[in-house]
């Protein structure tokens, strides 16, 4: 504790300060998405949501940030996916945000309103101080976990997560030595925040890299282990080899074909 | 719509040669990858070979590595299979197949197909 | 590579329903894709991604895949239907196959 009050004074943590113009970013980012990506959200305030996303970083010690902090700011940015629209995804955010830059009816956490705000930003707040840190920010592994972005990302995860009903899909990276990962967000947390009674699949796309590469990956072992995990708790689990990610660019780059998407 | 014609087929001694082509309209053809399939006489259906639409991948089945060439023309929205060393068991009607978006490795479109006759 | 193996021949009375299979390891783990071929003309898809169906495709039409087998049912089978159906799989590379062909027979 008496570290992290030094620390506090002096705003030298282990990790990157926060993004440069970062309200300005939010606000604009909150602009652009409700009255142009979704006008169904038109209806958003986006000063009131500043303010909400101001408030629960700003002032607080930036290694005591909790969800409960997140609820006004979640309860202004409440969104509804359609049931069938989810795609969760684990080390292939690119490749998932390719997918759904072509099917815009399909959303990532990233394409949502909350998620689309805080994409790839960095935040946070100094103690007792109205002040935003551009300086530095708690790093996860070096300095704490409860810091205003890793429990931003968790929070919204769990929400995203509880939400989503119907089919769910995942996209996982199959050239990673663990393709699903317990520790990763999906496996910690939106894993384990599927509802049963909504939630009827989970069909996990296993994306190959490899040119020529016919390996049959849902038979990998952490994907047994997923399988086990979702089957104990009333989801049923599918699995496909996705052998041809290159398709996803090939279509990204004439996004105006509409005939690219999969509504044959 | 979208549309596939097929032209080039016809009567071929086995070891000759014979490139089949595929003009593609309706859609943008460089989003995507393009097939053919061949079907022997009262046969089912057989996968030859397949390009991406960039074109940096092809693919052949094991019956005409080697021999058969697939290629495309972005440019002129038309799809090519150079076929060499011909043999009587390549004597099929030949599809040029449009494949399904994204996650999928189907073929949505096909064209009425060209006859290709190997024989002395 | 995996093999697809269906049956030669199936039989249907006009308004029942027809079931065609499509069996081949852990075929689960690929999607599935049904064409129907009628003499002389090339094939259609009535099913991909195991049981999604293209637009203009009757609702009659419709897909499953589980364990080691795929199947296409018609319910209502008309005598339209009367056709060739092959299954297909993409199992990575160079392996893009196709099942041997069934030929419904609508009776009556």
């Known amino acids: 504790v008496s570290r992290w009050h030094q620390q506090s004074q002096r705003s030298q943590w282990g990790g990157r300060g926060t993004t440069d113009r970062f309200p300005e970013i939010i606000l604009e980012r909150c602009v652009e998405y409700t009255q142009t990506l979704l006008p169904e959200m038109r209806h958003v305030d986006c000063q009131n949501i500043w303010d909400a996303f101001k408030g629960a970083f700003i002032s607080k010690h930036p290694c005591k940030i909790t969800e409960e902090d997140y609820q006004p700011l979640l309860k202004l940015g409440n969104q509804t996916v359609p049931c069938n629209k989810t795609l969760l995804w684990s080390r292939t955010k690119h490749l998932a945000h390719q997918y759904t830059e072509i099917q815009r009816d399909v959303f990532t956490l990233e394409d949502t309103l909350l998620g689309y705000l805080a994409d790839d930003l960095t935040w946070c707040g100094e103690f007792e101080t109205s002040e935003i840190n551009y300086r530095s920010c708690p790093d996860w592994r070096k300095d704490c976990s409860s810091n205003p972005v890793s429990v931003f990302w968790k929070t919204v995860s769990r929400r995203f997560a509880e939400s989503a009903c119907g089919v769910v899909h995942v996209m996982l990276n199959g050239s990673c030595s663990n393709i699903f990962d317990k520790k990763s967000t999906f496996g910690s947390v939106e894993v384990h925040n599927l509802q049963p009674e909504k939630v009827h699949t989970l069909e996990a796309w296993v994306m190959h890299d490899g040119r020529g590469d016919s390996r049959d990956l849902c038979q990998d072992p952490s994907i047994k282990e997923l399988e086990l995990i979702i089957s104990k708790r009333n989801i049923t689990f599918s699995c496909k080899n996705i052998y041809r990610p290159d398709k996803f660019l090939q279509c990204a780059k004439t996004p105006e074909d509409s005939s690219c998407i999969s509504k044959i | 719509q979208v549309q596939l014609v097929e032209s080039g087929g016809g009567l071929v001694q086995p070891g000759g040669s014979l490139r089949l082509s595929c003009a593609a309209s309706?859609?943008?053809?460089?989003?995507?990858?393009m097939n053919w399939v061949r079907q022997a006489p009262g046969k089912g259906l057989e996968w030859v070979s397949g390009?991406?639409?960039?074109?940096?991948?092809?693919y052949y089945a094991d019956s005409v590595k080697g021999r058969f060439t697939i290629s495309r023309d972005n440019s002129k929205n038309t799809l090519y299979l150079q076929m060499n060393s011909l043999r009587a068991e390549d004597t099929a009607v030949y599809y040029c197949a449009r494949d399904l978006p994204l996650v999928y490795t189907g073929f949505a479109y096909w064209g009425q197909g060209t006859l290709v006759t190997v024989s002395s | 590579d995996i093999e697809l193996t269906q049956p030669p021949s199936v039989s249907v009375a006009p308004g029942q329903t027809a079931r065609i299979s499509c069996s081949g390891d852990?075929?689960?783990?690929?999607?599935v894709y049904w064409y129907q071929q009628k003499p002389g003309q090339a094939p259609v898809l009535v099913i991909y991604?195991?049981?999604k169906r293209p637009s203009g495709i009757p609702e009659r039409f419709s897909g499953s895949n589980s364990g080691n087998t795929a199947t296409l049912t018609i319910s209502g089978t008309q005598a339209e239907d009367e056709a060739d159906y092959y299954c297909?799989?993409?199992?990575?590379?160079?392996?893009?196959?196709f099942g041997g062909g069934t030929k419904l027979t609508v009776l009556g």
């Open positions: 852990n075929l689960r783990h690929y999607y």
């Open positions: 309706g859609f943008t053809f460089s989003s995507y990858y």
């Open positions: 991604g195991d049981s």
């Open positions: 297909q799989t993409y199992t990575g590379g160079a392996s893009l196959v």
């Open positions: 390009i991406s639409g960039d074109p940096s991948n092809t």
